[in-house]
Protein backbone atom coordinates (compact mmCIF):
# COMPACT_ATOMS: atom_id res chain seq x y z
CA UNK A 1 0.00 0.00 0.00
CA UNK A 2 1.54 3.35 -0.99
CA UNK A 3 2.16 5.92 1.77
CA UNK A 4 -0.94 7.85 2.71
CA UNK A 5 -3.15 4.92 1.76
CA UNK A 6 -2.34 2.90 4.86
CA UNK A 7 -5.48 1.68 6.60
CA UNK A 8 -3.81 2.48 9.94
CA UNK A 9 -3.73 6.16 8.91
CA UNK A 10 -7.46 6.11 8.24
CA UNK A 11 -8.12 4.48 11.63
CA UNK A 12 -6.14 7.14 13.46
CA UNK A 13 -7.82 10.52 12.86
CA UNK A 14 -5.97 12.07 15.83
CA UNK A 15 -2.64 11.69 14.03
CA UNK A 16 -1.11 14.91 12.69
CA UNK A 17 -1.25 15.11 8.87
CA UNK A 18 2.15 14.48 7.29
CA UNK A 19 4.20 17.51 6.35
CA UNK A 20 5.50 17.80 2.78
CA UNK A 21 8.97 16.61 3.91
CA UNK A 22 7.54 13.65 5.84
CA UNK A 23 5.42 12.65 2.86
CA UNK A 24 8.46 12.72 0.54
CA UNK A 25 10.53 10.76 3.09
CA UNK A 26 7.79 8.12 3.43
CA UNK A 27 7.38 7.91 -0.34
CA UNK A 28 11.10 7.29 -0.94
CA UNK A 29 11.19 4.64 1.77
CA UNK A 30 8.17 2.94 0.22
CA UNK A 31 9.91 2.85 -3.19
CA UNK A 32 13.11 1.55 -1.59
CA UNK A 33 11.16 -1.29 0.02
CA UNK A 34 9.78 -2.12 -3.42
CA UNK A 35 13.26 -2.10 -4.95
CA UNK A 36 14.43 -4.39 -2.16
CA UNK A 37 11.73 -6.93 -3.09
CA UNK A 38 12.62 -6.73 -6.79
CA UNK A 39 16.32 -7.16 -6.01
CA UNK A 40 15.52 -10.31 -4.04
CA UNK A 41 13.86 -11.85 -7.10
CA UNK A 42 16.71 -10.77 -9.39
CA UNK A 43 19.41 -12.06 -7.06
CA UNK A 44 17.64 -15.37 -6.48
CA UNK A 45 17.11 -15.92 -10.20
CA UNK A 46 20.69 -15.28 -11.33
CA UNK A 47 24.16 -14.70 -9.91
CA UNK A 48 24.22 -11.11 -11.18
CA UNK A 49 24.38 -9.62 -7.69
CA UNK A 50 27.81 -11.14 -7.13
CA UNK A 51 29.08 -10.68 -10.69
CA UNK A 52 32.35 -8.89 -11.29
CA UNK A 53 31.46 -8.28 -14.94
CA UNK A 54 28.94 -5.58 -13.99
CA UNK A 55 31.41 -2.70 -14.53
CA UNK A 56 31.66 -3.80 -18.14
CA UNK A 57 27.91 -3.57 -18.67
CA UNK A 58 27.65 -0.38 -16.62
CA UNK A 59 29.70 1.49 -19.20
CA UNK A 60 26.94 1.01 -21.76
CA UNK A 61 24.21 2.30 -19.46
CA UNK A 62 23.87 6.00 -18.76
CA UNK A 63 22.21 5.63 -15.39
CA UNK A 64 21.81 8.79 -13.28
CA UNK A 65 24.37 9.01 -10.49
CA UNK A 66 25.02 11.50 -7.75
CA UNK A 67 28.34 13.33 -7.87
CA UNK A 68 29.87 15.94 -5.58
CA UNK A 69 29.08 18.75 -8.02
CA UNK A 70 25.34 18.00 -7.66
CA UNK A 71 25.31 19.54 -4.18
CA UNK A 72 23.64 16.57 -2.50
CA UNK A 73 26.62 15.36 -0.45
CA UNK A 74 27.59 16.74 2.96
CA UNK A 75 30.60 18.48 1.43
CA UNK A 76 29.40 21.29 -0.82
CA UNK A 77 25.75 20.74 0.07
CA UNK A 78 23.46 23.07 -1.91
CA UNK A 79 19.72 22.69 -1.44
CA UNK A 80 18.57 24.15 -4.76
CA UNK A 81 21.20 22.48 -6.97
CA UNK A 82 20.56 19.19 -5.21
CA UNK A 83 16.79 19.33 -5.60
CA UNK A 84 17.19 19.98 -9.33
CA UNK A 85 19.55 16.99 -9.58
CA UNK A 86 17.12 14.70 -7.70
CA UNK A 87 14.16 15.61 -9.90
CA UNK A 88 16.21 15.46 -13.14
CA UNK A 89 17.65 12.11 -12.10
CA UNK A 90 14.24 10.64 -11.28
CA UNK A 91 12.89 11.81 -14.64
CA UNK A 92 15.86 10.12 -16.34
CA UNK A 93 15.22 6.90 -14.40
CA UNK A 94 11.64 6.70 -15.69
CA UNK A 95 12.65 5.04 -18.98
CA UNK A 96 14.65 2.43 -17.07
CA UNK A 97 11.69 1.78 -14.76
CA UNK A 98 9.57 1.26 -17.88
CA UNK A 99 12.13 -1.29 -19.06
CA UNK A 100 11.73 -3.18 -15.77
CA UNK A 101 8.00 -3.67 -16.28
CA UNK A 102 8.24 -6.99 -18.13
CA UNK A 103 11.29 -8.26 -16.33
CA UNK A 104 9.64 -9.86 -13.31
CA UNK A 105 7.50 -12.93 -12.92
CA UNK A 106 6.44 -13.13 -9.27
CA UNK A 107 6.97 -9.40 -8.57
CA UNK A 108 5.17 -7.89 -11.55
CA UNK A 109 2.85 -5.79 -9.34
CA UNK A 110 5.79 -4.64 -7.26
CA UNK A 111 7.58 -3.38 -10.39
CA UNK A 112 4.45 -1.45 -11.38
CA UNK A 113 4.15 -0.01 -7.86
CA UNK A 114 7.77 1.22 -7.95
CA UNK A 115 7.13 2.91 -11.29
CA UNK A 116 3.88 4.58 -10.22
CA UNK A 117 5.24 5.63 -6.81
CA UNK A 118 8.22 7.26 -8.53
CA UNK A 119 5.84 9.35 -10.66
CA UNK A 120 4.08 10.50 -7.47
CA UNK A 121 7.45 11.26 -5.83
CA UNK A 122 8.44 13.44 -8.81
CA UNK A 123 5.18 15.40 -8.39
CA UNK A 124 5.84 15.90 -4.66
CA UNK A 125 9.36 17.14 -5.38
CA UNK A 126 8.29 19.45 -8.20
CA UNK A 127 5.96 21.19 -5.74
CA UNK A 128 8.94 21.66 -3.41
CA UNK A 129 11.29 23.01 -6.12
CA UNK A 130 11.52 26.75 -6.72
CA UNK A 131 13.68 26.65 -9.84
CA UNK A 132 11.66 24.39 -12.15
CA UNK A 133 13.23 26.01 -15.23
CA UNK A 134 16.56 24.31 -14.44
CA UNK A 135 14.94 20.87 -14.71
CA UNK A 136 15.40 19.27 -18.11
CA UNK A 137 12.90 16.63 -19.16
CA UNK A 138 14.32 13.70 -21.17
CA UNK A 139 13.46 13.63 -24.87
CA UNK A 140 10.65 11.07 -25.51
CA UNK A 141 12.13 10.01 -28.87
CA UNK A 142 15.53 9.32 -27.31
CA UNK A 143 13.84 7.37 -24.51
CA UNK A 144 11.84 5.27 -26.99
CA UNK A 145 14.93 4.27 -28.96
CA UNK A 146 16.82 3.52 -25.72
CA UNK A 147 13.99 1.26 -24.59
CA UNK A 148 14.02 -0.60 -27.92
CA UNK A 149 17.78 -1.03 -27.70
CA UNK A 150 17.63 -2.38 -24.13
CA UNK A 151 14.85 -4.82 -25.02
CA UNK A 152 16.84 -6.14 -27.99
CA UNK A 153 19.78 -7.25 -25.79
CA UNK A 154 20.52 -10.93 -25.22
CA UNK A 155 19.23 -12.64 -22.06
CA UNK A 156 22.44 -12.27 -20.05
CA UNK A 157 22.69 -8.55 -20.80
CA UNK A 158 19.02 -8.04 -19.97
CA UNK A 159 19.54 -9.72 -16.59
CA UNK A 160 22.61 -7.60 -15.96
CA UNK A 161 20.77 -4.43 -17.03
CA UNK A 162 17.92 -5.23 -14.62
CA UNK A 163 20.37 -5.75 -11.77
CA UNK A 164 22.26 -2.53 -12.55
CA UNK A 165 19.09 -0.44 -12.83
CA UNK A 166 17.83 -1.66 -9.46
CA UNK A 167 21.20 -1.16 -7.77
CA UNK A 168 21.69 2.32 -9.25
CA UNK A 169 18.13 3.40 -8.51
CA UNK A 170 18.46 2.21 -4.91
CA UNK A 171 21.73 4.12 -4.54
CA UNK A 172 20.28 7.26 -6.14
CA UNK A 173 17.22 7.18 -3.88
CA UNK A 174 19.31 6.62 -0.77
CA UNK A 175 21.52 9.60 -1.64
CA UNK A 176 18.37 11.62 -2.33
CA UNK A 177 16.83 10.61 0.99
CA UNK A 178 19.94 11.61 2.92
CA UNK A 179 20.07 14.96 1.12
CA UNK A 180 16.36 15.73 1.48
CA UNK A 181 16.65 15.13 5.21
CA UNK A 182 19.17 18.00 5.35
CA UNK A 183 16.70 20.42 3.76
Amino acid sequence: VPPGEDSKDVAAPHRQPLTSSERIDKQIRYILDGISALRKETCNKSNMCESSKEALAENNLNLPKMAEKDGCFQSGFNEETCLVKIITGLLEFEVYLEYLQNRFESSEEQARAVQMSTKVLIQFLQKKAKNLDAITTPDPTTNASLLTKLQAQNQWLQDMTTHLILRSFKEFLQSSLRALRQM
Epitope: I28, S36, E68, S75, E171, Q174, L177, R178, R181
Partner: antibody, heavy 123, light 107 residues
Protein backbone atom coordinates in the same frame (compact mmCIF):
# COMPACT_ATOMS: atom_id res chain seq x y z
CA UNK B 1 31.25 -15.10 9.20
CA UNK B 2 31.45 -11.31 9.17
CA UNK B 3 34.76 -9.94 10.41
CA UNK B 4 36.07 -6.39 10.73
CA UNK B 5 39.70 -5.97 11.75
CA UNK B 6 41.11 -2.51 12.42
CA UNK B 7 44.80 -1.61 12.30
CA UNK B 8 47.01 1.48 12.11
CA UNK B 9 46.46 2.91 15.58
CA UNK B 10 49.29 4.05 17.82
CA UNK B 11 50.91 6.94 19.64
CA UNK B 12 51.28 10.18 17.70
CA UNK B 13 52.22 13.77 18.58
CA UNK B 14 49.68 16.62 18.32
CA UNK B 15 49.59 17.87 14.72
CA UNK B 16 50.66 14.47 13.42
CA UNK B 17 48.90 12.02 11.11
CA UNK B 18 47.72 8.41 11.17
CA UNK B 19 45.93 6.21 8.70
CA UNK B 20 43.56 3.60 10.09
CA UNK B 21 42.55 0.56 8.04
CA UNK B 22 39.70 -1.87 8.47
CA UNK B 23 39.87 -5.21 6.66
CA UNK B 24 36.40 -6.63 6.05
CA UNK B 25 35.51 -10.24 5.26
CA UNK B 26 32.52 -12.58 5.28
CA UNK B 27 30.15 -10.29 3.32
CA UNK B 28 29.89 -8.38 0.03
CA UNK B 29 31.75 -5.29 1.24
CA UNK B 30 30.75 -3.06 -1.69
CA UNK B 31 27.05 -3.41 -0.84
CA UNK B 32 27.32 -1.87 2.62
CA UNK B 33 27.69 1.56 4.15
CA UNK B 34 30.64 1.65 6.53
CA UNK B 35 31.18 3.92 9.51
CA UNK B 36 33.92 4.86 11.97
CA UNK B 37 32.84 5.35 15.59
CA UNK B 38 35.21 6.33 18.41
CA UNK B 39 35.22 6.17 22.18
CA UNK B 40 37.49 8.34 24.32
CA UNK B 41 38.76 6.77 27.58
CA UNK B 42 35.87 6.49 30.08
CA UNK B 43 33.54 8.37 27.73
CA UNK B 44 30.58 7.53 25.48
CA UNK B 45 30.39 6.62 21.80
CA UNK B 46 30.94 9.29 19.14
CA UNK B 47 29.99 8.91 15.48
CA UNK B 48 32.98 10.02 13.39
CA UNK B 49 32.34 9.41 9.69
CA UNK B 50 30.34 7.32 7.21
CA UNK B 51 30.94 6.34 3.60
CA UNK B 52 28.21 5.05 1.36
CA UNK B 53 28.41 2.12 -1.02
CA UNK B 54 28.68 3.20 -4.64
CA UNK B 55 28.01 6.94 -4.64
CA UNK B 56 31.25 8.04 -3.00
CA UNK B 57 29.09 10.08 -0.64
CA UNK B 58 30.77 10.73 2.73
CA UNK B 59 29.75 12.45 5.96
CA UNK B 60 31.73 13.67 8.97
CA UNK B 61 31.20 14.79 12.54
CA UNK B 62 31.81 18.53 13.03
CA UNK B 63 34.72 17.72 15.36
CA UNK B 64 36.74 16.02 12.58
CA UNK B 65 35.52 17.77 9.43
CA UNK B 66 38.42 19.06 7.32
CA UNK B 67 40.97 16.96 9.22
CA UNK B 68 39.80 13.37 8.68
CA UNK B 69 39.08 11.65 5.37
CA UNK B 70 37.14 8.41 5.06
CA UNK B 71 37.64 6.23 1.97
CA UNK B 72 37.15 2.67 0.83
CA UNK B 73 38.69 0.24 -1.62
CA UNK B 74 35.94 -2.17 -2.66
CA UNK B 75 38.43 -4.34 -4.56
CA UNK B 76 40.48 -4.82 -1.40
CA UNK B 77 37.46 -4.97 0.96
CA UNK B 78 39.09 -2.28 3.05
CA UNK B 79 37.86 0.86 4.79
CA UNK B 80 40.27 3.69 5.67
CA UNK B 81 40.37 6.74 7.91
CA UNK B 82 43.12 9.25 7.17
CA UNK B 83 43.58 11.43 10.25
CA UNK B 84 45.55 14.66 9.92
CA UNK B 85 46.24 17.56 12.30
CA UNK B 86 45.55 15.28 15.25
CA UNK B 87 44.61 16.82 18.61
CA UNK B 88 44.72 15.38 22.13
CA UNK B 89 40.90 15.16 22.07
CA UNK B 90 41.14 12.64 19.20
CA UNK B 91 42.59 10.12 21.67
CA UNK B 92 40.17 7.19 21.61
CA UNK B 93 39.51 3.64 20.54
CA UNK B 94 38.37 3.77 16.90
CA UNK B 95 35.81 1.19 15.80
CA UNK B 96 35.04 0.18 12.23
CA UNK B 97 31.36 -0.71 11.84
CA UNK B 98 29.09 -2.10 9.15
CA UNK B 99 25.74 -0.47 8.54
CA UNK B 100 22.55 -2.48 8.23
CA UNK B 101 22.04 -0.59 4.95
CA UNK B 102 22.96 -3.55 2.75
CA UNK B 103 19.83 -5.34 3.86
CA UNK B 104 17.49 -2.79 5.39
CA UNK B 105 17.60 -0.05 2.84
CA UNK B 106 16.65 3.03 4.83
CA UNK B 107 17.58 2.30 8.41
CA UNK B 108 20.81 3.32 10.07
CA UNK B 109 22.16 0.85 12.58
CA UNK B 110 25.59 -0.71 13.04
CA UNK B 111 25.24 -4.49 13.19
CA UNK B 112 28.91 -5.51 13.19
CA UNK B 113 31.80 -3.85 15.01
CA UNK B 114 35.53 -4.47 14.89
CA UNK B 115 37.50 -4.88 18.12
CA UNK B 116 38.80 -1.32 17.77
CA UNK B 117 42.26 0.23 17.43
CA UNK B 118 43.72 2.61 20.03
CA UNK B 119 44.81 6.07 18.92
CA UNK B 120 46.73 8.16 21.47
CA UNK B 121 47.62 11.77 20.70
CA UNK B 122 50.17 13.05 23.18
CA UNK B 123 53.46 14.90 23.30
CA UNK C 1 22.48 19.68 14.49
CA UNK C 2 20.01 17.27 16.05
CA UNK C 3 20.74 16.78 19.73
CA UNK C 4 19.89 13.57 21.61
CA UNK C 5 19.13 13.67 25.31
CA UNK C 6 19.29 10.27 26.93
CA UNK C 7 17.91 9.75 30.43
CA UNK C 8 18.61 8.75 33.08
CA UNK C 9 22.43 8.83 32.91
CA UNK C 10 22.47 5.88 35.32
CA UNK C 11 19.96 3.70 37.10
CA UNK C 12 19.95 0.98 39.73
CA UNK C 13 17.49 -1.89 39.42
CA UNK C 14 16.90 -5.35 40.84
CA UNK C 15 16.97 -8.51 38.75
CA UNK C 16 13.54 -9.14 37.30
CA UNK C 17 12.63 -5.43 37.26
CA UNK C 18 11.33 -3.69 34.18
CA UNK C 19 13.78 -1.00 33.10
CA UNK C 20 13.00 1.97 30.86
CA UNK C 21 15.52 4.28 29.18
CA UNK C 22 14.40 7.28 27.13
CA UNK C 23 15.99 9.19 24.30
CA UNK C 24 14.69 12.61 23.28
CA UNK C 25 15.61 14.21 19.94
CA UNK C 26 15.67 17.99 19.51
CA UNK C 27 13.69 17.60 16.26
CA UNK C 28 11.85 14.84 14.44
CA UNK C 29 14.01 11.93 13.30
CA UNK C 30 11.15 9.74 12.03
CA UNK C 31 12.05 6.20 13.19
CA UNK C 32 15.79 6.51 12.47
CA UNK C 33 16.89 5.57 15.95
CA UNK C 34 18.92 2.56 17.08
CA UNK C 35 19.90 1.26 20.51
CA UNK C 36 23.24 -0.32 21.56
CA UNK C 37 24.46 -2.22 24.58
CA UNK C 38 28.08 -2.02 25.72
CA UNK C 39 29.51 -4.13 28.51
CA UNK C 40 32.83 -3.10 30.16
CA UNK C 41 35.80 -3.99 27.97
CA UNK C 42 33.55 -5.13 25.10
CA UNK C 43 32.48 -3.69 21.76
CA UNK C 44 28.98 -2.23 21.44
CA UNK C 45 26.17 -4.52 20.27
CA UNK C 46 23.14 -3.48 18.20
CA UNK C 47 19.86 -4.25 20.00
CA UNK C 48 17.16 -2.28 18.20
CA UNK C 49 17.07 -0.50 14.83
CA UNK C 50 14.34 1.53 13.15
CA UNK C 51 13.15 2.54 16.66
CA UNK C 52 11.35 -0.75 17.30
CA UNK C 53 12.84 -3.58 15.22
CA UNK C 54 14.65 -6.22 17.26
CA UNK C 55 18.04 -7.18 15.84
CA UNK C 56 18.49 -10.90 15.09
CA UNK C 57 19.69 -12.84 18.12
CA UNK C 58 18.69 -10.22 20.66
CA UNK C 59 16.46 -11.55 23.50
CA UNK C 60 12.80 -10.59 23.25
CA UNK C 61 12.86 -8.95 26.70
CA UNK C 62 14.38 -5.95 24.88
CA UNK C 63 11.91 -3.72 23.05
CA UNK C 64 11.99 -0.29 21.48
CA UNK C 65 9.21 2.17 20.82
CA UNK C 66 8.65 5.75 19.71
CA UNK C 67 8.72 7.91 16.61
CA UNK C 68 9.46 11.53 15.83
CA UNK C 69 11.22 12.99 18.87
CA UNK C 70 10.54 10.59 21.75
CA UNK C 71 11.94 7.06 22.04
CA UNK C 72 12.09 4.35 24.68
CA UNK C 73 14.13 1.21 25.28
CA UNK C 74 12.51 -1.24 27.68
CA UNK C 75 14.06 -4.31 29.30
CA UNK C 76 11.22 -6.45 30.63
CA UNK C 77 12.68 -8.56 33.40
CA UNK C 78 16.27 -7.45 33.96
CA UNK C 79 18.84 -10.24 33.93
CA UNK C 80 22.41 -10.16 35.26
CA UNK C 81 23.84 -10.19 31.72
CA UNK C 82 21.93 -6.95 30.95
CA UNK C 83 24.08 -4.87 33.32
CA UNK C 84 25.80 -2.55 30.86
CA UNK C 85 25.76 0.93 29.35
CA UNK C 86 23.07 1.63 26.72
CA UNK C 87 23.32 4.20 23.94
CA UNK C 88 20.81 5.55 21.42
CA UNK C 89 21.89 6.82 17.97
CA UNK C 90 20.06 9.09 15.56
CA UNK C 91 20.79 8.21 11.95
CA UNK C 92 18.34 10.61 10.36
CA UNK C 93 20.42 13.67 9.60
CA UNK C 94 24.14 14.49 9.49
CA UNK C 95 25.98 14.71 11.77
CA UNK C 96 24.68 11.47 13.27
CA UNK C 97 24.72 11.52 17.04
CA UNK C 98 24.82 9.12 19.97
CA UNK C 99 23.09 9.80 23.25
CA UNK C 100 25.28 10.28 26.33
CA UNK C 101 24.63 6.74 27.55
CA UNK C 102 22.73 5.13 30.44
CA UNK C 103 24.56 2.87 32.86
CA UNK C 104 22.36 0.09 34.26
CA UNK C 105 23.61 -1.21 37.60
CA UNK C 106 22.36 -3.63 40.22
CA UNK C 107 20.50 -2.15 43.19
Amino acid sequence: QVQLVESGGGLVQPGGSLRLSCAASGFTFSNYYMTWVRQAPGKGLEWVSSIYSFSGDTAYADSVKGRFTISRDNAKNTLYLQMNSLKSEDTAVYYCTRNLGGVVVTTNGYDYWGQGTQVTVSS
Amino acid sequence: DIQLTQSPSSLSASLGDSVTITCQASQSISDELSWYQQKPGQTPKLLIYGASKLQTGVPSRFSGSGSGTSFTLTISGLEAEDLATYYCLQGYRWPFMFGQGTKVELK
